[in-house]
Amino acid sequence: KEITNALETWGALGQDINLDIPSFQMSDDIDDIKWEKTSDKKKIAQFRKEKETFKEKDTYKLFKNGTLKIKHLKTDDQDIYKVSIYDTKGKNVLEKIFDLKIQERVSKPKISWTCINTTLTCEVMNGTDPELNLYQDGKHLKLSQRVITHKWTTSLSAKFKCTAGNKVSKESSVEPVSCPEKGLD
Protein backbone atom coordinates (compact mmCIF):
# COMPACT_ATOMS: atom_id res chain seq x y z
CA LYS A 1 0.00 0.00 0.00
CA GLU A 2 2.81 2.40 0.89
CA ILE A 3 4.31 2.36 -2.60
CA THR A 4 1.12 2.19 -4.64
CA ASN A 5 -0.33 5.26 -2.95
CA ALA A 6 2.91 7.24 -3.10
CA LEU A 7 3.10 10.70 -4.63
CA GLU A 8 6.08 10.69 -6.97
CA THR A 9 8.16 13.77 -6.24
CA TRP A 10 11.34 14.86 -8.00
CA GLY A 11 14.15 16.88 -6.45
CA ALA A 12 17.41 18.30 -7.80
CA LEU A 13 20.69 17.28 -6.21
CA GLY A 14 22.07 20.13 -4.09
CA GLN A 15 18.80 22.08 -4.21
CA ASP A 16 16.04 22.39 -1.58
CA ILE A 17 12.65 20.73 -1.93
CA ASN A 18 9.30 21.24 -0.22
CA LEU A 19 7.10 18.21 0.36
CA ASP A 20 3.66 19.84 0.40
CA ILE A 21 0.69 17.91 1.78
CA PRO A 22 -2.07 17.98 -0.85
CA SER A 23 -5.61 18.90 0.24
CA PHE A 24 -4.55 19.63 3.82
CA GLN A 25 -5.61 22.74 5.70
CA MET A 26 -4.12 23.42 9.13
CA SER A 27 -6.75 23.93 11.86
CA ASP A 28 -7.03 24.22 15.66
CA ASP A 29 -8.03 20.54 15.81
CA ILE A 30 -4.61 19.42 14.55
CA ASP A 31 -2.32 18.43 17.40
CA ASP A 32 0.46 16.46 15.75
CA ILE A 33 2.19 16.32 12.36
CA LYS A 34 4.85 13.65 12.03
CA TRP A 35 7.23 12.89 9.15
CA GLU A 36 9.06 9.57 8.85
CA LYS A 37 11.81 8.47 6.49
CA THR A 38 10.90 4.88 5.62
CA SER A 39 14.36 3.38 5.12
CA ASP A 40 15.60 4.86 8.42
CA LYS A 41 12.44 3.59 10.15
CA LYS A 42 12.26 6.68 12.30
CA LYS A 43 10.81 10.13 12.81
CA ILE A 44 12.67 12.92 11.08
CA ALA A 45 10.44 15.84 12.05
CA GLN A 46 7.43 16.40 14.27
CA PHE A 47 5.22 19.37 15.01
CA ARG A 48 3.16 19.16 18.18
CA LYS A 49 0.88 22.00 19.17
CA GLU A 50 2.37 24.24 21.88
CA LYS A 51 5.47 22.04 22.02
CA GLU A 52 8.93 22.48 20.59
CA THR A 53 9.15 21.23 17.00
CA PHE A 54 11.42 18.20 16.65
CA LYS A 55 13.93 17.91 13.81
CA GLU A 56 16.26 14.95 13.38
CA LYS A 57 18.82 17.24 11.72
CA ASP A 58 19.20 20.83 10.52
CA THR A 59 18.62 19.94 6.88
CA TYR A 60 14.93 19.44 7.76
CA LYS A 61 12.51 22.29 8.33
CA LEU A 62 8.87 21.74 9.26
CA PHE A 63 6.44 24.52 8.48
CA LYS A 64 3.25 25.13 10.44
CA ASN A 65 1.14 23.97 7.48
CA GLY A 66 2.84 20.56 7.67
CA THR A 67 5.15 21.06 4.69
CA LEU A 68 8.56 19.45 5.10
CA LYS A 69 11.54 21.25 3.57
CA ILE A 70 14.66 19.19 2.89
CA LYS A 71 17.65 21.44 2.30
CA HIS A 72 20.60 20.79 -0.03
CA LEU A 73 19.38 17.41 -1.31
CA LYS A 74 21.87 14.56 -1.24
CA THR A 75 21.59 11.18 -2.96
CA ASP A 76 20.72 9.45 0.33
CA ASP A 77 17.70 11.73 0.72
CA GLN A 78 16.10 9.68 -2.05
CA ASP A 79 13.56 7.67 -0.11
CA ILE A 80 9.91 7.12 0.70
CA TYR A 81 8.59 9.66 3.20
CA LYS A 82 5.39 9.34 5.21
CA VAL A 83 3.47 12.15 6.87
CA SER A 84 0.87 11.33 9.54
CA ILE A 85 -1.48 13.94 10.98
CA TYR A 86 -3.40 13.52 14.24
CA ASP A 87 -6.06 15.57 16.00
CA THR A 88 -6.19 16.59 19.67
CA LYS A 89 -7.74 13.22 20.60
CA GLY A 90 -4.92 11.28 18.93
CA LYS A 91 -7.09 10.28 15.96
CA ASN A 92 -5.45 9.68 12.61
CA VAL A 93 -6.73 12.50 10.36
CA LEU A 94 -4.55 12.05 7.27
CA GLU A 95 -1.65 10.01 5.93
CA LYS A 96 0.33 10.58 2.76
CA ILE A 97 3.32 8.85 1.21
CA PHE A 98 5.91 10.67 -0.90
CA ASP A 99 8.32 8.81 -3.17
CA LEU A 100 11.16 11.32 -3.41
CA LYS A 101 13.48 10.74 -6.35
CA ILE A 102 16.60 12.80 -6.85
CA GLN A 103 18.36 13.72 -10.06
CA GLU A 104 21.43 15.76 -10.89
CA ARG A 105 20.53 18.78 -13.02
CA VAL A 106 21.55 18.58 -16.68
CA SER A 107 24.40 20.71 -17.92
CA LYS A 108 24.09 22.98 -20.96
CA PRO A 109 24.43 20.77 -24.06
CA LYS A 110 27.53 21.34 -26.21
CA ILE A 111 27.10 21.54 -29.98
CA SER A 112 30.11 20.86 -32.22
CA TRP A 113 30.31 20.17 -35.95
CA THR A 114 32.59 19.45 -38.83
CA CYS A 115 32.00 20.82 -42.30
CA ILE A 116 34.14 18.18 -44.00
CA ASN A 117 31.43 15.54 -43.76
CA THR A 118 28.61 17.87 -42.56
CA THR A 119 28.35 16.07 -39.22
CA LEU A 120 27.05 17.72 -36.06
CA THR A 121 27.31 16.39 -32.51
CA CYS A 122 25.32 17.44 -29.50
CA GLU A 123 26.48 16.18 -26.13
CA VAL A 124 25.44 16.66 -22.50
CA MET A 125 28.13 16.01 -19.91
CA ASN A 126 26.21 16.08 -16.60
CA GLY A 127 22.80 15.10 -15.37
CA THR A 128 20.80 12.03 -14.37
CA ASP A 129 18.90 10.29 -17.19
CA PRO A 130 19.10 13.20 -19.62
CA GLU A 131 16.93 13.35 -22.71
CA LEU A 132 18.54 15.07 -25.68
CA ASN A 133 16.56 16.54 -28.56
CA LEU A 134 18.01 18.01 -31.73
CA TYR A 135 16.18 20.48 -33.96
CA GLN A 136 17.18 21.92 -37.33
CA ASP A 137 15.51 25.18 -38.26
CA GLY A 138 12.71 24.40 -35.79
CA LYS A 139 12.08 20.86 -37.02
CA HIS A 140 12.66 17.95 -34.64
CA LEU A 141 15.36 15.59 -35.91
CA LYS A 142 16.52 13.20 -33.24
CA LEU A 143 16.04 12.05 -29.66
CA SER A 144 18.78 10.39 -27.62
CA GLN A 145 20.31 10.17 -24.16
CA ARG A 146 23.80 11.67 -23.85
CA VAL A 147 25.06 12.12 -27.41
CA ILE A 148 23.39 12.85 -30.73
CA THR A 149 25.34 12.62 -33.97
CA HIS A 150 23.62 13.97 -37.08
CA LYS A 151 24.73 14.21 -40.69
CA TRP A 152 22.88 16.93 -42.55
CA THR A 153 22.47 17.22 -46.29
CA THR A 154 19.63 19.63 -46.94
CA SER A 155 21.69 22.82 -46.89
CA LEU A 156 25.12 23.92 -45.82
CA SER A 157 23.74 26.60 -43.52
CA ALA A 158 21.26 25.82 -40.79
CA LYS A 159 20.25 26.82 -37.27
CA PHE A 160 20.56 23.90 -34.86
CA LYS A 161 19.03 23.78 -31.42
CA CYS A 162 19.85 21.09 -28.88
CA THR A 163 17.86 20.68 -25.66
CA ALA A 164 18.80 18.54 -22.67
CA GLY A 165 16.30 17.83 -19.96
CA ASN A 166 15.28 15.53 -17.14
CA LYS A 167 12.63 15.62 -14.41
CA VAL A 168 14.31 18.48 -12.54
CA SER A 169 15.95 20.68 -15.17
CA LYS A 170 16.11 21.79 -18.80
CA GLU A 171 18.95 23.45 -20.72
CA SER A 172 19.38 24.32 -24.39
CA SER A 173 22.00 25.54 -26.83
CA VAL A 174 21.52 27.15 -30.24
CA GLU A 175 24.20 27.28 -32.93
CA PRO A 176 23.88 28.79 -36.41
CA VAL A 177 26.00 26.43 -38.52
CA SER A 178 27.40 27.65 -41.81
CA CYS A 179 29.71 25.65 -44.03
CA PRO A 180 31.44 26.76 -47.23
CA GLU A 181 30.44 25.06 -50.51
CA LYS A 182 33.60 22.93 -50.63
CA GLY A 183 33.05 21.60 -47.11
CA LEU A 184 36.13 23.04 -45.40
CA ASP A 185 36.49 22.57 -41.65
Epitope: K1, K43, Q46, K91, N92
Partner: antibody
Framework: EVKLVESGGGLVKPGGSLKLSCAAS????????MSWVRQTPEKRLEWVAS???????YYLDSVKGRFTISRDNARNILYLHMTSLRSEDTAMYYC???????????WGQGTSVTVSS | DILLTQSPAILSVSPGERVSFSCRAS??????IHWYQQRTTGSPRLLIK???ESISGIPSRFSGSGSGTDFTLSINSVESEDVADYYC?????????FGGGTKLEIE
Protein backbone atom coordinates in the same frame (compact mmCIF):
# COMPACT_ATOMS: atom_id res chain seq x y z
CA GLU B 1 -15.92 3.95 27.90
CA VAL B 2 -13.11 2.55 25.77
CA LYS B 3 -13.08 -1.24 25.79
CA LEU B 4 -10.81 -3.73 24.00
CA VAL B 5 -11.50 -7.46 24.29
CA GLU B 6 -9.07 -10.00 22.82
CA SER B 7 -9.90 -13.60 21.92
CA GLY B 8 -8.52 -16.48 19.88
CA GLY B 9 -5.51 -17.49 21.94
CA GLY B 10 -4.70 -21.06 22.90
CA LEU B 11 -2.22 -23.90 22.73
CA VAL B 12 -0.73 -24.61 19.29
CA LYS B 13 2.07 -26.81 17.97
CA PRO B 14 5.19 -25.28 16.38
CA GLY B 15 4.46 -24.46 12.74
CA GLY B 16 0.78 -24.05 13.49
CA SER B 17 -1.51 -21.05 13.06
CA LEU B 18 -3.84 -18.91 15.15
CA LYS B 19 -6.01 -15.88 14.46
CA LEU B 20 -6.42 -13.41 17.30
CA SER B 21 -9.30 -10.95 17.39
CA CYS B 22 -9.83 -7.74 19.32
CA ALA B 23 -13.32 -6.29 19.61
CA ALA B 24 -13.23 -2.53 20.15
CA SER B 25 -15.95 -0.26 21.52
CA UNK B 26 -16.38 3.18 23.08
CA UNK B 27 -14.40 5.14 20.45
CA UNK B 28 -14.28 5.80 16.71
CA UNK B 29 -12.30 2.66 15.87
CA UNK B 30 -11.67 3.49 12.19
CA UNK B 31 -9.92 6.76 13.08
CA UNK B 32 -7.28 5.30 15.37
CA UNK B 33 -4.06 3.45 14.75
CA MET B 34 -4.10 0.07 16.50
CA SER B 35 -1.35 -2.26 17.72
CA TRP B 36 -0.59 -5.71 19.04
CA VAL B 37 1.90 -5.97 21.91
CA ARG B 38 2.97 -9.22 23.54
CA GLN B 39 4.38 -10.03 26.96
CA THR B 40 6.72 -12.98 27.26
CA PRO B 41 6.62 -15.39 30.22
CA GLU B 42 9.65 -13.45 31.55
CA LYS B 43 7.37 -10.35 31.59
CA ARG B 44 9.25 -8.58 28.77
CA LEU B 45 6.96 -6.34 26.66
CA GLU B 46 7.44 -6.52 22.90
CA TRP B 47 5.62 -4.49 20.26
CA VAL B 48 4.51 -6.86 17.47
CA ALA B 49 2.60 -4.94 14.79
CA SER B 50 0.63 -1.78 14.08
CA UNK B 51 -1.97 -0.74 11.54
CA UNK B 52 -2.67 2.93 10.92
CA UNK B 53 -6.05 4.52 10.38
CA UNK B 54 -5.28 4.59 6.67
CA UNK B 55 -4.23 0.93 6.61
CA UNK B 56 -0.44 1.27 6.62
CA UNK B 57 1.25 -1.71 8.24
CA TYR B 58 4.29 -2.05 10.50
CA TYR B 59 5.80 -5.30 11.83
CA LEU B 60 8.50 -6.46 14.15
CA ASP B 61 11.21 -8.02 11.94
CA SER B 62 10.97 -11.43 13.63
CA VAL B 63 7.25 -11.77 12.74
CA LYS B 64 7.35 -10.23 9.25
CA GLY B 65 6.07 -12.71 6.68
CA ARG B 66 4.51 -14.89 9.39
CA PHE B 67 2.04 -12.54 11.08
CA THR B 68 -0.57 -10.34 9.40
CA ILE B 69 -2.33 -7.46 11.12
CA SER B 70 -5.66 -6.33 9.67
CA ARG B 71 -8.80 -4.48 10.67
CA ASP B 72 -12.51 -4.55 9.91
CA ASN B 73 -13.68 -0.98 10.45
CA ALA B 74 -17.32 -1.90 9.79
CA ARG B 75 -17.30 -4.40 12.67
CA ASN B 76 -14.75 -2.60 14.90
CA ILE B 77 -12.43 -5.60 15.04
CA LEU B 78 -8.64 -5.80 14.92
CA TYR B 79 -7.01 -9.09 13.86
CA LEU B 80 -3.63 -10.75 14.11
CA HIS B 81 -3.24 -13.81 11.90
CA MET B 82 -0.23 -15.78 13.09
CA THR B 83 1.31 -18.56 10.99
CA SER B 84 4.49 -20.67 11.22
CA LEU B 85 4.37 -20.23 14.98
CA ARG B 86 7.53 -20.79 17.01
CA SER B 87 8.11 -21.48 20.70
CA GLU B 88 9.47 -17.93 21.09
CA ASP B 89 6.04 -16.59 20.08
CA THR B 90 4.65 -17.90 23.38
CA ALA B 91 3.28 -14.85 25.19
CA MET B 92 0.26 -12.94 26.38
CA TYR B 93 -0.97 -10.93 23.39
CA TYR B 94 -2.50 -7.52 24.04
CA CYS B 95 -4.48 -5.36 21.68
CA UNK B 96 -3.88 -1.64 22.24
CA UNK B 97 -5.14 1.63 20.83
CA UNK B 98 -2.23 3.69 19.49
CA UNK B 99 -3.05 7.34 19.98
CA UNK B 100 -0.94 9.63 17.78
CA UNK B 101 0.35 6.38 16.26
CA UNK B 102 2.89 6.24 19.06
CA UNK B 103 1.54 5.55 22.53
CA UNK B 104 -0.73 2.79 23.77
CA UNK B 105 -3.38 4.63 25.76
CA UNK B 106 -5.84 1.73 26.14
CA TRP B 107 -5.09 -1.98 26.43
CA GLY B 108 -7.22 -5.10 26.39
CA GLN B 109 -7.02 -7.82 29.05
CA GLY B 110 -4.85 -10.00 26.78
CA THR B 111 -5.17 -13.45 25.27
CA SER B 112 -2.61 -16.18 25.98
CA VAL B 113 -0.76 -17.97 23.17
CA THR B 114 1.35 -21.05 23.96
CA VAL B 115 3.43 -22.68 21.22
CA SER B 116 4.56 -26.11 22.34
CA SER B 117 4.75 -29.66 21.03
CA ASP C 1 16.74 -0.97 16.94
CA ILE C 2 16.63 1.51 19.80
CA LEU C 3 17.52 -0.18 23.08
CA LEU C 4 15.94 1.08 26.32
CA THR C 5 17.71 0.24 29.57
CA GLN C 6 15.77 0.61 32.81
CA SER C 7 17.44 0.74 36.20
CA PRO C 8 17.34 -0.52 38.81
CA ALA C 9 15.53 -3.81 38.23
CA ILE C 10 13.89 -3.59 41.66
CA LEU C 11 13.17 -0.56 43.86
CA SER C 12 12.10 -0.92 47.46
CA VAL C 13 10.71 2.14 49.28
CA SER C 14 8.58 3.07 52.26
CA PRO C 15 5.12 4.61 51.85
CA GLY C 16 5.25 8.40 51.48
CA GLU C 17 8.76 8.41 50.04
CA ARG C 18 9.68 9.88 46.67
CA VAL C 19 10.89 7.39 44.10
CA SER C 20 12.48 7.75 40.66
CA PHE C 21 12.73 5.24 37.81
CA SER C 22 15.43 5.63 35.15
CA CYS C 23 15.20 4.83 31.44
CA ARG C 24 18.16 5.31 29.11
CA ALA C 25 17.94 5.14 25.31
CA SER C 26 20.75 3.84 23.08
CA UNK C 27 20.40 6.92 20.83
CA UNK C 28 18.83 10.38 21.00
CA UNK C 29 15.05 10.15 20.75
CA UNK C 30 13.88 13.66 21.61
CA UNK C 31 10.94 13.28 23.99
CA UNK C 32 9.40 10.21 22.32
CA ILE C 33 9.17 8.20 25.53
CA HIS C 34 6.06 6.95 27.31
CA TRP C 35 5.67 5.33 30.73
CA TYR C 36 3.37 2.46 31.75
CA GLN C 37 2.38 0.82 35.02
CA GLN C 38 1.44 -2.85 35.22
CA ARG C 39 0.04 -4.22 38.43
CA THR C 40 0.46 -7.96 39.18
CA THR C 41 -2.70 -9.23 37.52
CA GLY C 42 -3.53 -6.42 35.12
CA SER C 43 -2.69 -4.98 31.72
CA PRO C 44 -0.27 -2.09 31.23
CA ARG C 45 -1.69 1.39 31.89
CA LEU C 46 -0.35 4.60 30.34
CA LEU C 47 0.99 7.02 32.99
CA ILE C 48 3.00 9.68 31.13
CA LYS C 49 3.30 10.49 27.43
CA UNK C 50 6.10 12.24 25.54
CA UNK C 51 8.46 12.17 28.53
CA UNK C 52 6.61 14.68 30.73
CA GLU C 53 2.98 15.09 29.66
CA SER C 54 0.32 14.03 32.14
CA ILE C 55 -2.54 11.66 31.32
CA SER C 56 -6.15 12.29 32.32
CA GLY C 57 -7.18 10.12 35.30
CA ILE C 58 -3.61 9.46 36.46
CA PRO C 59 -2.84 10.77 39.98
CA SER C 60 -0.73 13.96 40.04
CA ARG C 61 1.95 12.28 42.13
CA PHE C 62 3.24 10.72 38.89
CA SER C 63 5.53 12.93 36.80
CA GLY C 64 8.12 12.51 34.09
CA SER C 65 11.17 14.36 32.82
CA GLY C 66 14.07 14.11 30.42
CA SER C 67 14.91 14.38 26.72
CA GLY C 68 17.51 13.00 24.36
CA THR C 69 18.71 9.77 25.97
CA ASP C 70 17.95 10.03 29.70
CA PHE C 71 14.44 9.89 31.12
CA THR C 72 12.95 9.69 34.59
CA LEU C 73 9.56 8.73 36.01
CA SER C 74 8.93 9.98 39.53
CA ILE C 75 6.31 9.26 42.18
CA ASN C 76 6.50 12.05 44.73
CA SER C 77 4.74 10.21 47.57
CA VAL C 78 4.47 6.46 47.11
CA GLU C 79 1.25 4.71 48.08
CA SER C 80 0.68 0.99 48.57
CA GLU C 81 -1.41 0.81 45.38
CA ASP C 82 1.70 1.85 43.40
CA VAL C 83 3.24 -1.61 43.83
CA ALA C 84 3.69 -2.66 40.21
CA ASP C 85 6.11 -3.04 37.32
CA TYR C 86 6.99 0.18 35.44
CA TYR C 87 7.98 0.20 31.79
CA CYS C 88 9.23 2.88 29.41
CA UNK C 89 8.52 2.72 25.64
CA UNK C 90 10.04 4.68 22.78
CA UNK C 91 8.18 5.77 19.63
CA UNK C 92 11.01 7.56 17.86
CA UNK C 93 11.75 4.67 15.52
CA UNK C 94 10.40 1.34 14.33
CA UNK C 95 10.23 -1.11 15.89
CA UNK C 96 8.77 0.50 18.98
CA UNK C 97 10.69 -0.91 21.94
CA PHE C 98 10.11 -1.23 25.67
CA GLY C 99 12.54 -1.17 28.55
CA GLY C 100 13.00 -4.29 30.66
CA GLY C 101 10.93 -2.80 33.49
CA THR C 102 11.49 -1.84 37.11
CA LYS C 103 9.58 -3.57 39.92
CA LEU C 104 8.44 -1.29 42.72
CA GLU C 105 8.10 -2.87 46.15
CA ILE C 106 6.87 -1.32 49.38
CA GLU C 107 8.95 -2.00 52.49
Amino acid sequence: EVKLVESGGGLVKPGGSLKLSCAASGFTFSSYDMSWVRQTPEKRLEWVASISGGGFLYYLDSVKGRFTISRDNARNILYLHMTSLRSEDTAMYYCARSSYGELMDYWGQGTSVTVSS
Amino acid sequence: DILLTQSPAILSVSPGERVSFSCRASQRIGTSIHWYQQRTTGSPRLLIKYASESISGIPSRFSGSGSGTDFTLSINSVESEDVADYYCQQSHGWPFTFGGGTKLEIE
